[in-house]
């Protein structure tokens, strides 16, 4: 009897998640089962299901399967958090790249290589054809999506809506082209799920056909999601166990990223004089083991043969014969030149001591000369002399080299928010240091805040179409989702960056968050064609006390008719009093039957002193805050609006002048709203965008 194939490997798992159908017309099929594998087999074969199964949920508590003809990207559906549920989505329907000739491609690209819209498969206009959905069952000839039902050479194609062009291939990349890794791929978290010879990978949470020790729950930081290629054990490149019982494991064909920028949260801190942690980041020149025996060169095979070569372990700095820790051992080590002693630890290298005395800075800390050498996020500072090239990239004068000694926190670029340093961690290239301003220091960090010298608008004009506000005008509005529900607003200020508030992040687990762009309805109803759902890859917290967060998207947003960026004001600028502004949000409206549509409230700018009076003198506003009062009594931002923008117009240019943060109740009559003044933090925002690497689209 032929062994039934285990198809669960064809699904992407989202733990603690289920799908709720908003559209009652959508069908669901349920049945009691024992395992998720049984659900998967039935979904793949569509056995006994009155629809094409695209996803299923396994209810672990009730031991029940729920099969769906839709997935999380479908319209009329929303994700919901639930401990007892696991969502499995067929990868073919969510993959945006092809494997081989793309026969299994079931994605939603519907535009040809030259940009022509595809003709629906069920239509005979403008081109008559025989590729009817009914004739090609299982090939998913839905809508006008690109497909390759016969597995032809060029990859997925479609008949075009242009009567002059009968058909054309679609420009869908090979998965092996899209996926790339840095170094030896230890930080790779991509979606490659087959080996270089084309074998399908075994799920990490399965023990068949091959038993193994790499259980996801035992190694939560190794990215053991589904059956994607990973490098948890310091191999030369990512690999996986295969579904072939005769091939235990194989490497995966993942190319090296062009710019080779690392994007790993676990990048070790580079040190040269001492060992931090297990010394994986040690880059010093000690070249003997603890008892003085010299090390063997890493590029030599004498006296000991090995595969720890510089070619196999890129980015591990296996230069000369220096002690290193390329494989996650307990500390730096090397092969020795003594034929009788293969390896030895270099335990004579001291541990780094990150202790520091307490101190403070005055003004913006440009004259701070203390010896703190650690960032507020706990990272050790890296040497200034190693980072001069980066520093020159974002300042336009020669920094005072006499101040930039060792790796101490300094402020060579006149940053308004205090001393900082480079870290040696590519994910967090630099950060502020945990030093406070000296008590009683009142030196302003921006001068002339109350004199409207600097205009907020840059010189370029905003394009207004016939002067009619359209949905395009709010394309920068972001709905931040926490566990599949709207939690906060945000503003898209760059394709990969969203400006929002610190208060919007109950959890530090980035998998709990998503950004929805291009929507008008908070549930995404009616926004399917324009909605973009993006994961969050990093949170960059603003300077101490700012309440700001820059949220980096896992991939850049695609700017189109529904998604656009909004401009930032000039640093330290002042907007004239009574300027008309607006706040936007999907938050609490005071209405019982809230329709979920984006709301706007119109406010006008109020000077800080006048604002303080309106708050009965109980509030003293500082240079980092901006005040705006409501034109209509009792309107203004509230819960769910936090993180969203205060948008003002100057010289026909719209800008995000403020960020909504919680504080003093919602829309209290005669109490103007107090927002974070974006102009005060504009240099910080630009510095982050300039220096933090963004993912390639």
């Amino acid at each position: 009897q032929r062994k039934r194939r285990n198809t669960i490997h064809e699904f992407k798992k989202s733990a603690k998640t289920t799908l709720i159908k908003i559209d009652p017309a959508l069908k669901i099929k349920t049945k009691k089962v024992n395992t998720a594998d049984q659900c998967a087999n039935r979904c793949t074969r569509n056995k006994g299901l009155p629809f094409t199964c695209k996803a299923f949920v396994f209810d672990k508590a009730r031991k029940q399967c729920l099969w769906f003809p839709f997935n999380s990207m479908s319209s009329g559906v929303k994700k919901e958090f639930g401990h007892e549920f696991d969502l499995y989505e067929n990868k073919d329907y969510i993959r945006n790249c092809i494997i081989g000739k793309g026969r299994s491609y079931k994605g939603t690209v519907s535009i040809t290589k030259s940009g022509i819209k595809c003709q629906p498969w069920s239509s005979m206009i403008p081109h008559e054809h025989s590729f009817l959905p009914s004739s090609y069952r299982g090939k998913d000839l839905q809508e006008n999506y690109c497909r390759n039902p016969r597995g032809e050479e060029g990859g997925p194609w479609c008949f075009t809506s242009n009567p002059e062009v009968r058909y054309e291939v679609c420009d869908i990349p090979q998965c092996s082209e899209v996926e790339c890794m840095t170094c030896n791929g230890e930080s790779y978290r991509g979606l490659m799920d087959h080996t270089e010879s084309g074998k399908i990978c075994q799920r990490w949470d399965h023990q068949t056909p091959h038993r193994h020790k790499f259980l996801p729950e035992r190694y939560p930081d190794k990215g053991f999601d589904d059956n994607y290629c990973r490098n948890p054990d310091g191999q030369p490149r990512p690999w996986c166990y295969t579904l072939d019982p005769h091939t235990r494991w194989e490497y995966c064909a993942i190319k090296t990223c062009a710019d080779n920028t690392m994007n790993d949260t676990d990048v070790p801190l580079e040190t040269t004089e001492c060992i931090q942690g297990q010394g994986e980041g040690y880059r010093g020149t000690v070249n003997t083991i603890w008892n003085g025996i010299p090390c063997q060169r890493w590029d030599s095979q004498y006296p000991h043969e090995h595969d720890m070569t510089p070619e196999n372990f890129k980015c591990k700095d296996l230069r000369e014969n220096y002690c290193r820790n390329p494989d996650g051992s307990e500390s730096p080590w090397c092969f020795t030149t003594d034929p009788n002693i293969r390896v030895g630890y270099c335990s004579q290298i001291p541990n780094c001591d990150m202790s520091h005395g307490q101190d403070c800075y005055r003004g913006n800390g440009k004259n701070y000369m203390g010896n703190l050498s650690q960032t507020r996020s706990g990272l050790t500072c890296s040497m200034w002399d190693k980072n001069m090239e980066d520093l020159h990239r974002h300042i336009f004068w020669e920094p005072d080299a006499s101040k930039l000694n060792e790796n101490y926190c300094r402020n060579p670029d006149d940053d308004a928010h205090g001393p900082w340093c480079y870290t040696g961690n590519p994910l967090i290239p630099w950060d502020y240091c945990p030093i406070s301003r000296c008590e009683g220091d009142t030196t302003p960090t921006i001068v002339n805040l109350d004199h409207p010298v600097i205009s907020c608008a840059k010189t370029k004009q905003l394009r207004v179409v016939n002067g009619i506000p359209t949905r395009t005008n709010i394309g920068w509005m972001v709905s931040l989702r926490y566990r599949n529900k709207h939690i906060c607003g945000g503003s898209l200020i760059k394709e990969s960056w969203v400006l929002t508030a610190r208060q919007c992040f109950p959890s530090r687990d980035l998998k709990d968050y998503e950004a929805w762009l291009g929507i008008h309805d908070v549930h995404g109803r009616g926004d399917e064609k324009c909605k973009q759902v993006l994961n969050v890859s990093q949170l960059v917290y603003g300077p101490e006390g700012s309440d700001l967060v820059l949220m980096k998207l896992a991939r850049p947003a695609v700017l189109d008719d529904f998604v656009s960026t909004i401009d930032l004001p000039n640093y330290g600028c002042t907007i004239p009093e009574k300027t008309s502004c607006s706040v936007y949000g999907w938050g609490y409206t005071g209405l019982i039957n809230y329709d979920g549509l984006l709301r706007v409230a119109h406010l006008y700018i109020m000077g800080n002193e006048k604002c303080s009076q309106h708050h009965r003198g109980k509030v003293t506003l500082n240079e980092s805050e901006i005040c705006a009062g409501a034109e209509k009594i009792g309107s203004g931002p509230c819960e769910g609006d936090y993180g969203g923008p205060l948008v003002c117009e100057q010289h026909k240019m719209r800008m995000v002048l403020g960020v909504i943060v919680p504080g003093r109740g919602c829309a209290i009559p005669n109490r103007p709203g107090i927002f974070v003044r974006v102009a005060y933090y504009a240099k910080w925002i630009h510095k982050i965008i300039l220096t933090y690497k963004v993912p390639q689209s």
Epitope: H83, P220, D221, T265, M354, Q374, R376, S377, G378, Y482, K485, I487, C488, R502, Q503, C504, F505, P506, S507, R508, D509, D512, L539, Y541, D547, G587, Y588, E639, G640, Y642, V661, P662, G663, R664, G665
Partner: antibody, heavy 115, light 110 residues
């Protein structure tokens, strides 16, 4: 600074509400936690209230037994039906940084549950 | 569930000595771990946050390290004033938590 109030001697089953008041910062801008400590025992995290429409999170043992709320400019902890095991000093704390640690604590208020 | 286990429950140390307290998380919490010091009749006081960053006004004799699931607090050159109970606390996630704090370690200075 922070100050807790409302701690007193109550009989089992009598609901009790503790209040946390802030001075020197705007309480509405921060997540706030409640923590308790029974005499001679360690710190026990009860729960946290966020600044937005997300429901408060509670320790698994505290669900249903406590309710955290934000009436205007204070943060309240309601012990719904106290038992003798709820005798403890109750602290409120401001959650700072990246919302990941408590940087300001109140001095605590003592609740004694006894019949 | 992000539960915290602290060891030892109690430790005795001589003035000038070094004491090491360990804290283990049931799941990876990156570096979102804080250490607090509590003396009898007082609320806890923040010592270290983000696993290794010293809080304002805290002596550099206190040192935190670790990431993922294993963390350490080291007090070197112990002084009489260091006699207290020390607690670790995870700040990675607040949902589905039994106790965000470790059980505590009492440091007795001889």
């Amino acid at each position: 600074s922070l100050e807790e109030s409302g701690g007193r001697l109550v009989t089992p089953g009598t609901p009790l509400t503790l209040t946390c008041t802030a001075s020197g910062f705007t309480i509405g801008r921060y997540y706030m936690s409640w923590v308790r400590q029974a005499p001679g025992k360690g710190l026990e995290w009860i729960g946290i209230i966020y600044t937005h429409g997300v429901n408060p999170d509670y320790a698994s043992w505290a669900k249903g037994r406590f309710t955290i709320s934000r009436p205007s400019t204070t943060v309240d902890l309601k012990i719904t039906s106290p038992t003798t095991e709820d005798t403890a000093t109750y602290f409120c704390a401001r959650v700072g940084g990246f919302n990941d640690y408590s940087d300001i604590w109140g001095p605590g208020t003592l609740v004694t549950v006894s019949s | 569930a992000y539960d915290m286990t602290q060891t030892p429950a109690s430790v005795e140390v001589a003035v000038g000595g070094t004491v090491t307290i360990k804290c283990q998380a049931s799941e990876s919490i990156s570096t979102y771990l804080a250490w607090y010091q509590q003396k009898p009749g007082q609320p806890p006081k923040l010592l270290i946050y983000r696993a290794s960053t010293l809080a304002s006004g805290v002596s550099s004799r206190f040192k935190g390290s670790g990431s993922g699931t294993q963390f350490t607090l080291t007090i070197s050159g112990v002084e009489c004033a260091d006699a207290a109970t020390y607690y670790c606390q995870q700040g990675y996630s607040y949902s589905n938590v039994d106790n965000a704090f470790g059980g505590g370690t009492e440091v007795v200075v001889k």
